[in-house]
Interface confidence: low
Amino acid sequence: GELETSDVVTVVLGQDAKLPCFYRGDSGEQVGQVAWARVDAGEGAQELALLHSKYGLHVSPAYEGRVEQPPPPRNPLDGSVLLRNAVQADEGEYECRVSTFPAGSFQARLRLRVLVPPLPSLNPGPALEEGQGLTLAASCTAEGSPAPSVTWDTEVKGTTSSRSFKHSRSAAVTSEFHLVPSRSMNGQPLTCVVSHPGLLQDQRITHILHVSFLAEASVRGLEDQNLWHIGREGAMLKCLSEGQPPPSYNWTRLDGPLPSGVRVDGDTLGFPPLTTEHSGIYVCHVSNEFSSRDSQVTVDVLDPQEDSGKQVDLVSAS
């Protein structure tokens, strides 16, 4: 006859491990007893349990309450045992020794592998600002046994680097994602993906990128200077910019205070019916926590009387 077992039994932390040992004998052969021991290299043998055909299961004190026979029905030639609630310290080599009649003794070894699924954590890097060079966006750490795989899933262009630290019974893997921040990355997801044989599916943690920036400011409203004439109603200047965080706007006049009747409404400067008093240099100040920008324009309010007078003079002079 011969013993049937597995080379490796793999179990997830906290699960029950079935340690298989089945004697496939010839007709009429019987199993008298099965002895289970832990036999890690250099540490000698430590008895787990003795399974006797007549007296049943005897469990050594070190494994009291943790070693059982599989539930019935049981085959008298089956010397398998269950190790309850596997912990990392259970990982190692095990041996079953089977005493048979009349064939004698047989022994076989197996390795118990206890998978420790990782609990990943994602830590965002420092605040991202446009104009920085290569910057840490996030780091992701997962510890398990065996070492987990940590990768990144994102549309954002960047570089990754990983390092692992081996502990006595596990390994911690940290992967860092570095990028050169740009405004187009705002709101983009950066997902840490952790794979491990002890997980039914990959674990994913997503971080949404926030990149601080402030665009150059520009002022609209002066595209047609001829519209800026005395008496015109509804004239306005609008300051254009964008930023993250959203910017605030402030209007000033470079050559004096804002004229009375001019309304500041956020990014818009609204004028009452235009007079020559409204001519001047206007400045839009745009700012957020990241930066500030200025844009200035010169308003020159035309006097139609002066213009028509000039035209007459030109005609008469010709």
Partner: antibody, heavy 117, light 106 residues
């Protein structure tokens, strides 16, 4: 003890493709990268690229259009192909091993490739 | 690419001297720097990784220091077998090497 050994033709004609093989022995290359690095005569070192045991690659951007690195894991062999060579590609070509970080703990002895007609 | 500037490009020293080689990165590379020794006609040999960690089998007279952009390789009590060319290399993104420092016998 891990050992790396480069092999391939010592002379390549201009505009042709340079092909080299790196054979790794004495250890597993699982979870390691095999890199190609070159050194023109009397000059400094230049990193060309890396391939990981799983087959993923990373190349030097300045040579990316011309470099291809591949692996035959069953033979523990890693190949470098550099296309459209010129005299400026004449160098000693090394293969080297690294972990996840790109510093190189084991190197081959190097092989001199001359580009000449 | 990050540029690595090594100085001096060559130096002369005697057995027993202390030698210092510096390497400057064009941007912050944190501690992602390695040092290699290369003898004529041979492959480079890793001396130091992650700026300060001595590689296996490297004598303790070698030491690395620095972080960010400025790094140093120091050889205490120079031995005859230490006359060689030394290279720094960053591994922060695409690796690049310094131009090398040749340590010659005075």
């Amino acid at each position: 003890q891990v050992q790396l050994q480069e092999s391939g033709p010592g002379l390549v004609k201009p505009s042709e493709t340079l092909s080299l093989t790196c054979t790794v022995s004495g250890g597993s290359i699982t979870n390691y990268g095999v890199h190609w690095i070159r050194q023109p005569p009397g000059k400094g070192l230049e990193w060309l690229g890396v391939i990981w045991s799983g087959g993923s690659t990373d190349y030097n951007p300045s040579l990316k259009s011309r470099v291809t690195i591949s692996v035959d894991t069953s033979k523990n062999q890693f190949s470098l192909k550099l296309s459209s060579v010129t005299a400026a590609d004449t160098a000693v070509y090394y293969c080297a091993r690294s972990g996840k970080w790109y510093y190189f703990d084991y190197w081959g002895q190097g092989t001199l490739v001359t580009v000449s007609s | 690419d990050i540029q690595m500037t090594q100085s001096p490009s060559s130096l002369s020293a005697s057995v027993g001297d202390t030698v210092t080689i510096t390497c400057r990165a064009s941007q912050n590379i944190y501690s992602n720097l390695a040092w290699y020794q290369q003898k004529q006609g041979k492959a480079p040999k890793l001396l130091v990784y992650a700026a300060t960690n001595l590689a296996d089998g490297v004598p303790s007279r070698f030491s690395g220091s620095g972080s960010g952009t400025d790094f140093t390789l120091k050889i205490n009590s120079l031995q005859p077998e230490d006359f060689a060319t030394y290279y720094c290399q960053h591994f922060w993104g695409t690796p690049t090497f310094g131009g090398g420092t040749k340590v010659e016998i005075k």
